[in-house]
Each structure stands twice: as C-alpha cells, then as structure tokens.
Interface confidence: low
C-alpha cells in the first residue's frame, strides 16, 4: 500500500496557498478526513496527519493530552502539508504515547479531530 | 481495479465554455483528491490544483483565474472541469489524476480555434 | 513557486546504456519528489515517488535518489520501451511544479 502524499509533503504556512474558486469565495472551514489512530514501535518514527480545508486558509495547532505539543529539535515537529498538517515524532519512547488533537481555525469557525498513538 | 476515464476531446470558439468530465471507477471517489494538470500542444505538465470529493473544496494554483472551476456529482463518482470565456492559449489536454497521482484519466484534448 | 530545472533537456541514448536525468529546485523540497515517464498522446505514468521510492509495477532498472535541492532518475540498462519524455514534480509547496521535462531519444 503506498502512503499518500500528505506524509512528509512539508509545506510553507497554509497562510501562503493562494485559492481561487467560486467555490471559495464564502468563508467555511472544514475536516476532510478525520485523524488516524497509530500504533508503532519503540524507536520508530510516528505521523499523524490533520486534514482540513478553510477559507481564509486555517492556523492549525497541536495537543498532547490536552497541553501544547512542543517541537524537539530533529525528534519532535509538526508542519503543514498540502492537505493540511503533519505531526512527526522520531525514535518513539514509551512517553510519546496518548491522545493527539489537531485545532484549525480560520479566525471565525474552530474544527479539531483527535488521534491516539499507542 | 482503479481508472479514470475522461470525455472525449472538444472544439470550441473563443468565448465558449467548456466542461470535461473525469469518472472515477474501482476506488471511493470520496476519500481522494483529484488533481487537474494541463498540458499545451508540446509543451510540459502544469498542475491546476484539486477537489476535494468529500466536501468540494478546491485548492487552485494561481495561475489559474476564476474562469476556471471544480466540480463534482458523486452520485455517478464524477470530477469536473468548467472553463469559461475560453481563449487560445486554454488549447491543451487536460488530465485528470487520484491524490498521489498515482492513476491518470486518458486526458481531454480541448481545442479553442475561430 | 518553487522552480524545477531538468538537465538535460533531451538526450540521445542506446538499449542497453545507464542514463541518468537530474531535476534541481529552486528551494529545498525535502524528499517530496515524483518523477514521471510520459509517451506521446498518453497520460504520464508514474515511476519513483518520494524521490527514491518505487511505484507498483515499474521496473526495477528505474531508480531514484536525491533530497533537498538535487535528484537523479537512472535507467540502469535502457529498453527499447524506455524512449519517452521525463518529467519531475515537487510536492513540497503550493502551487505544485513540474520540470520541463527531458525527451530521451534513440541514438
């Protein structure tokens, strides 16, 4: 099964992608696809993907447990991605493990999906 | 197994509008994007931007104006491409392709000619 | 937009030789890299994915490598089959972009 391109596909800030549709021209803020849970390794590397679409194109934040997810320098990150943003965790330790939410809003409407790496 | 088989080719005077369609076959057309890429007479690949079956979002490149939209009838798992106030330089093939461009439609030539 | 700019634009081969075709971008793209072969009057077909990641049913001659800025399509041992246009697409960044493509032709 190949991977979709969402994994790895680093984006610059969603704030950048220029939409041009009359499909567009309202504001909406929309989950595409709701988050996977993950089940890995120890000393693997974890991704969880937030897929979500808005207009003005959406601020998405992560959360561990309900706290901010802090990035770790070339262990711990999150960007966007063409279909929205990317949380990757490298060399997995047992610590890494719960509940993960995506928070996007577009300044008006807030959208979130939660999911569980164990 | 997946396919994507788009209409036939289109001759159209400048001005007209023009809409091709992309029928998906042998996947959920709902949980993948579809992507447009154009293609003028010899030249390369220019990718348009997507839809997003689920919901009809789109995501266009901005090179291409509002003349040019996305749809969708998911009741026969089909994409669309509308263009209007056709113009000379809109003569290509279009294709259509599944979220990681992994499956092609056959493309649409559209021709715009006086 | 991030610009994609293959070398060599075209080249001349024999069955049998190793080609390779370089695609540079503009700005580090990561490993998010498709390269394609397309044949006249049909739809490209996807060769490697993720810069360096076979897709499902292409031959094994075909291989990828490269990150960041510089990526590379080999053809270990050209078949007849494999005269056609080459193109590579960087997924990193909005709008997507392909190259311009590099026509390999038959010497």
């Known amino acids: 099964q190949e991977t979709e391109l969402s994994v790895s596909a680093e984006l610059v800030p969603t704030s950048s992608w220029n939409i041009s549709s009359e499909l567009n021209k309202d504001s909406y803020l929309t989950l595409d696809e709701p988050m996977n849970n993950i089940t890995t390794s120890l000393g693997q590397t974890a991704e969880l993907h937030c897929k979500v679409s808005g207009n003005p194109p959406p601020t998405i934040r992560w959360f561990k447990n309900d706290a901010p997810v802090v990035q770790e320098p070339r262990r711990l990150s999150f960007r966007s991605t063409i279909y929205g943003s990317r949380l990757r965790i490298r060399n997995l330790d047992t610590t890494d493990t719960g509940y993960f939410q995506c928070v996007a809003t577009n300044g008006k409407e807030v959208v979130s999906s939660t999911g569980v790496l164990f | 197994q997946v396919q994507l088989v788009q209409s036939g080719s289109e001759l159209k005077k400048p001005g007209a509008s023009v809409k091709v369609s992309c029928k998906a076959s042998?996947?959920?057309?709902?949980?993948?994007?579809m992507h447009w890429v154009r293609q003028a007479p010899g030249q390369g690949l220019e990718w348009m931007g997507w839809i997003y079956p689920g919901n009809g979002n789109t995501k266009f490149n901005h090179k291409f104006d509002g003349r040019f939209v996305f749809s969708l009838d998911t009741s026969v798992s089909t994409a669309y491409l509308q263009i209007s106030s056709l113009k000379a330089e809109d003569t290509a093939v279009y294709y259509c392709?599944?979220?990681?461009?992994?499956?092609w439609g056959q493309g649409t030539l559209v021709t715009v000619s006086s | 937009d991030i610009q994609m700019t293959q070398s060599p634009s075209s080249l001349s081969a024999s069955v049998g030789d190793r080609v390779t075709i370089t695609c540079q971008a503009s700005?580090?793209?990561?490993?998010?890299l498709i390269w394609y072969q397309q044949k006249p009057g049909k739809a490209p077909k996807r060769l490697i994915y993720f810069a360096t990641s076979l897709a499902n049913g292409v031959p094994s001659r075909f291989s990828g490598s490269g990150s960041g800025t510089e990526f590379t399509l080999t053809i270990s041992s050209l078949q007849p089959e494999d005269f056609a246009t080459y193109y590579c697409?960087?997924?990193?960044?909005?709008?997507?972009?392909f190259g311009q493509g590099t026509k390999l032709e038959i010497k």
């Open positions: 392709a599944r979220s990681d461009f992994d499956y």
């Open positions: 697409l960087q997924y990193r960044e909005y709008p997507l972009t």
């Open positions: 042998g996947y959920t057309l709902t949980t993948n994007y």
């Open positions: 700005q580090d793209i990561g490993n998010n």
